[in-house]
């Protein structure tokens, strides 16, 4: 669709005569009839296939024609067409004399024609005017013409329709050739696709308007490039949504089981060495001078009763010192100057002479020991307590203080981990040397049968448009990770249609 425009500029008829040569009385009151038609090698009469237009009386004899486009649009003359401009045309311009006010063809005498010109040729669509001048024996006509496209029509033939818009169906203006020019922030063939926030992850994020970044399920962060771990994940991370990959030293489905008690809790005191020995289990190796499960008890060096023959022990900063009874000497009072005559055996011990009376030996009653039967038997010296238990002398007897997880007189019994019914959902518990194991009934899994093993929610292929399906173990549901251009809980909506989120 377009308009052929004809601008009449000057008409010269100096003698004021008609085509017949007869003069007009009193002068030639001149108006024009224009016929636009398809290209003809020889312009002949017939229908004006592209349109016709007439002017009012524009002047008498010779006159210039005023540009009147602003005041009513009479000059240039408009010949609209609603078809593809063919690029060629024929044009007939007739100048007529109007004796009266009625300009209809049937109201004029046939000899009222002043002049007639006919041209034909090629004409491309464009803003520039083509100037032309046609001269006959008695008259001269100067004019210019052009073809322009109607509003919203573009291209070499005015055949391309383009109407700027900024709505759901597109966000663009039109280029001179009719191609779309997207408004800032929009892209795509029809400028319907928003340009997301710079850096927004192509798969994990999307947008419904420019410069935003909306995250698909399981992703978060300004650019939707951070995955959300499995709900309940305590000491773990993810590389894809709903994962729980445990940090160093943690285990279990939710990474909530402490496998590195030594590092996380530092239970061993006084510079002892800590060794992990299972979940929440550890062993402390004490430095000299310390004892106890956590090496929390300071040992006196005299506790080992190093002084013999009734010597008394005194603690010193750099060790101990033995004060020997009369008749004995040496670091531990181990050397004797006595004989049986001096009654050296204590606690009812019997004395036996040796080396012709130069020496002696004591035979001690039960519960006593030492070269002079001066020491009570330490029932702990044989380390009777198993599994790292601590031995304590209690008068004539002894007892073992057991580490957590052990019981019995000598800490020889492993406390049953199954006693507290740790297996969920009717799981069967089995005691192991270093912990326990649950045998789960159908439909449950995990270390403690705490995880409901669902039918794979993704088995029915619920996601559309080649989306990736994830099963959310905590809820027995699926999550669809949509490819670019689709949204919705099943990726069923192309971007542009309003999705409904379950927020």
């Amino acid at each position: 669709s377009g308009v052929f425009q004809l601008q009449l500029q000057e008409f010269i008829n100096e003698r004021g005569v008609l085509a017949s040569g007869r003069p007009c009385e009193p002068g030639c009151r001149t108006f024009f009839r224009v016929c636009l038609k398809h290209f003809q090698a020889v312009v002949s009469p017939g229908p004006c296939t592209f349109g016709t237009v007439s002017t009012p009386v524009l002047g008498t004899n010779s006159f210039a024609v005023r540009d009147d486009s602003s005041g009513g649009g009479r000059n240039p003359l408009q010949l609209p067409f609603n078809f593809t401009w063919p690029g060629t045309f024929s044009l007939i311009i007739e100048a007529w004399h109007a004796p009266g006010d009625d300009l209809r063809p049937e109201a004029l005498p046939p000899d009222a024609l002043i002049s007639k010109i006919a041209i034909q040729g090629s004409l491309a669509v464009g803003q520039n005017w083509l100037l032309d001048e046609q001269t006959s024996t008695l008259t001269r006509l100067r004019y210019s013409y052009r073809v322009i496209c109607s509003d919203n029509y573009y291209g070499d033939n005015c055949s391309r329709l383009c109407k700027k818009r900024n709505d759901h169906f597109g966000h663009y203006v039109c280029q001179p050739d009719g191609n779309l020019s997207c408004l800032p922030g929009w892209t795509g063939e029809y400028c319907q696709q928003p340009i997301c926030l710079s850096g927004c992850h192509e798969q994990n994020g999307y947008c419904s308007k420019p410069a935003e970044c909306l995250c698909r399920p399981g992703w978060q962060g300004r650019l939707c490039n951070e995955c959300i771990p499995h709900n309940g994940c305590r000491h773990g991370t993810c590389s894809t949504p709903w994962q729980c990959t445990c940090d160093e030293g943690w285990g279990g489905l939710f990474c909530d089981q402490d496998l590195n008690y030594c590092t996380h809790h530092s239970p061993c005191k006084n510079g002892a060495t800590c060794s992990n020995s299972g979940q929440r289990s550890y062993t402390c190796t004490c430095r000299p001078g310390y004892t106890g499960v956590d090496c929390e008890l300071e040992l006196s060096e005299c506790d080992s009763n190093p002084c013999r023959n009734g010597g008394s022990c005194k603690d010193q900063e750099d060790g101990y010192h033995c004060l020997c009874p009369p008749g004995y000497y040496g670091l531990h009072c181990e050397h004797s100057t006595l004989s049986c005559a001096d009654s050296p055996c204590f606690n009812g011990g019997s004395c036996r002479e040796r080396n012709q009376g130069a020496n002696y030996a004591c035979e001690c009653p039960p519960n006593f020991t030492g070269s002079n039967c001066e020491k009570k038997v330490d029932r702990c010296t044989s380390n009777p307590c198993a599994n790292g238990g601590q031995c304590l002398n209690r008068g004539p007897s002894r007892m073992c203080r057991c580490r957590p997880g052990f019981t019995g007189t000598y800490c020889e019994l492993h406390v049953s981990d199954c006693a507290r019914n740790p297996c969920a959902h009717g799981g069967t518990c089995h005691d192991l040397e270093n912990g326990l194991m649950c045998t789960c009934p159908a439909g449950f899994s995990g270390r403690r049968c705490e995880v409901r093993t669902s039918i794979d929610a993704c088995a029915s292929s619920p996601c559309f448009n080649r989306a990736t399906c994830y099963t959310d173990l905590s809820t027995d549901t699926f999550v669809c990770n949509c490819p670019y251009g689709f949204v919705g809980s099943r990726c069923e909506f192309p971007v542009g249609l309003p999705p409904s989120f379950p927020w």
Epitope: E212, L214, G221, I228, P229, H230, W503
Partner: nanobody, 123 residues
Framework: EVQLVESGGGLVQAGGSLRLSCAAS????????MSWVRQAPGKGPEWVSA????????YYADLVKGRFTISRDNAKNTLYLQMNSLKPEDTAVYYC????????????????WGQGTQVTVSS
């Protein structure tokens, strides 16, 4: 069920301070980015501040930059907003929310909201 419960709002003189808290439950708080949003009477929701899941990255709207501080305690499942040098134009209902969409300046679409706590700053 996801629950976000705000507290700490009240009436304060211009130039004063308040500390808002948001107690979270029903989800693994330490795995999610969190945000504060406010809504003044007769106006739409306005993003105030946001913090990433670990607490190391914070974001602030221009209007509150330098006056408000967002923080979180993942062990206590709690989000905080320390508001200093308060102005009458800070009067609004303040919500804590889980963001799920970002615009050029900050979060603008949210998965869950709390019920809000009223902050009134008098001149």
């Amino acid at each position: 069920e996801v629950q976000l419960v705000e507290s700490g709002g009240g009436l304060v003189q211009a130039g004063g301070s308040l500390r808002l808290s948001c107690a979270a439950s029903g989800f693994t708080f330490g795995s999610y980015d969190m945000s504060w949003v406010r809504q003044a009477p007769g106006k739409g929701p306005e993003w105030v501040s946001a913090i990433n899941s670990g607490g190391g990255i914070t974001y602030y709207a221009d209007l509150v930059k330098g006056r408000f501080t967002i923080s979180r305690d993942n062990a206590k499942n709690t989000l905080y907003l320390q508001m200093n040098s308060l102005k009458p134009e800070d009067t609004a209902v303040y919500y804590c929310a889980i963001p799920r969409g970002w615009g050029p300046t900050g979060p603008h679409e949210y998965g869950y909201w709390g019920q809000g706590t009223q902050v009134t700053v008098s001149s």
